[in-house]
């Protein structure tokens, strides 16, 4: 499974699209910034088998896809950019799913790192809660956009580690 090559390119495209999606100046939102507790340790690929790492990546992108597929998200972002971004994420999910199937067949035990998956889910719950509390304001979405760019960047680091494991 040549995940890292295809996935890294897709991730870079997703980051560029997300960068282009900004609608208001982030400098008007400094007071709205929030520590969502990005579980950075879950992006340390050295502690995972390849299958586990792919599962964490999948969860990360699935949750990002879900977040940007809501009605509130549709109202917040320019439609064509949002569609391109979602399509990019969807394509990455398909690639990852194909990789998981392939990798599981090669490993003796398809280990799932439940703690890591849970940490990622809780992280996105905190993001969703923040948006709800801020009533999905433009600044709240701007803060979340920056946070998702940060998390996608971390997942890029995980992909680099995966590439070395190939």
């Amino acid at each position: 499974c040549d995940l890292p090559q295809t996935h890294s390119l897709g991730n870079r495209r997703a980051l560029i699209l997300l960068a282009q999606m900004g609608r208001i100046s982030p400098f008007s939102c400094l007071k709205d910034r929030h520590d969502f507790g990005l579980p950075q340790e879950e992006f340390d690929g050295n502690q995972f088998q390849k299958t586990q790492a792919i599962s964490v990546l999948h969860e990360m992108i699935q949750q990002t896809f879900n977040l940007f597929s809501t009605e509130d998200s549709s109202a917040a972002w320019e439609q064509s950019l949002l569609e391109k971004f979602s399509t990019e994420l969807y394509q990455q999910l398909n690639n990852l799913e194909a990789c998981v199937i392939q990798e599981v067949g090669m490993e003796e035990t398809p280990l799932m790192n439940e703690d890591s998956i849970l940490a990622v889910r809780k992280y996105f719950q905190r993001i969703t809660l923040y948006l709800t509390e801020k009533k999905y304001s433009p600044c709240a979405w701007e803060v979340v956009r920056a946070e998702i760019m940060r998390s996608l960047s971390f997942s890029t680091n995980l992909q680099k580690i995966l590439r070395r494991k190939d």
């Epitope: 960068a19 939102c29 400094l30 910034r33 929030h34």
Partner: antibody, heavy 120, light 111 residues
């Protein structure tokens, strides 16, 4: 690798204007904010402002609002800063620096600096 | 504007000892879990180099002898053990609100 190449030393007369450049390479120029920072000889650092090359959005330190104008040409991967109505106080080294860590607003890569000397 | 007061203005520390630099903000630069204070090192004739971001996070590639701490208005940069190559001027910078400002700098000399 990431590089920010700034224009060379500038000598200007009081009252004149100067425009300096900062050519970026090794990264996606349009997706990172670019800060500009002033450093007078033997003194500290002052934040002038920031530009987003992707759409030209700018934010200034009010102190420099009427002094500096930030622009960018994406086709040339180059950011510019124009300083107007120069006085001796504007004699300094000016750095362009790439924004880092998204909304943490730190600065990772720095240009080598453009030295501006204002003298009659 | 938030004023950052660094102290001392200069200090001389023996090789292998601890250097402690303080940065006090005129107003809190912490909000919702993050402290928006960062530290830079500038050697003579060179550009500043990011050492620490968000008060305590070590930038990639920076030696572990550098550490940062603090929240609200009071922040500290520690270097231990000090090495010859650490001779430089150190600046704090906040990004809590506009305009971002820097401290006046602390010059570290190695004895």
């Amino acid at each position: 690798q990431v590089q920010l190449q700034e224009s060379g030393t500038v000598l200007a007369r009081p009252g004149a204007s100067v425009k300096m450049s900062c050519k970026a390479s090794g990264y996606s120029f349009t997706t990172y904010w670019m800060h500009w920072v002033k450093q007078r000889p033997g003194q500290g650092l002052e934040w002038i402002g920031v530009i987003y090359p992707g759409n030209g959005d700018t934010t200034y330190n009010q102190k420099f609002k009427d002094k500096a104008k930030l622009t960018a040409v994406t086709s040339a991967n180059t950011a510019y800063m124009e300083l107007s109505s120069l006085t001796n106080e504007d004699s300094a080294v000016y750095f362009c620096t790439r924004n880092y860590k998204y909304d943490y607003y730190t600065m990772d890569y720095w240009g080598q600096g453009t030295t501006v000397t204002v003298s009659s | 504007d938030i004023v950052l007061t660094q102290s001392p203005a200069s200090l001389a520390v023996s090789l292998g000892q601890r250097a402690t630099i303080s940065c006090r903000a005129s107003k809190s630069v912490s909000t919702s879990g993050h402290s928006y204070m960062h530290w830079y090192q500038q050697k003579p004739g060179q550009t500043p180099k990011l050492l620490i971001y968000l008060a305590s996070n070590l930038e990639s590639g920076v030696p572990a002898r550098f550490s940062g701490s603090g929240s609200g208005t009071d922040f500290t940069l520690n270097i231990h053990p000090v090495e010859e190559e650490d001779a430089a001027t150190y600046y704090c910078q906040h990004s809590g609100e506009l305009p971002f400002t820097f401290g006046s700098g602390t010059k570290l000399e190695i004895k």
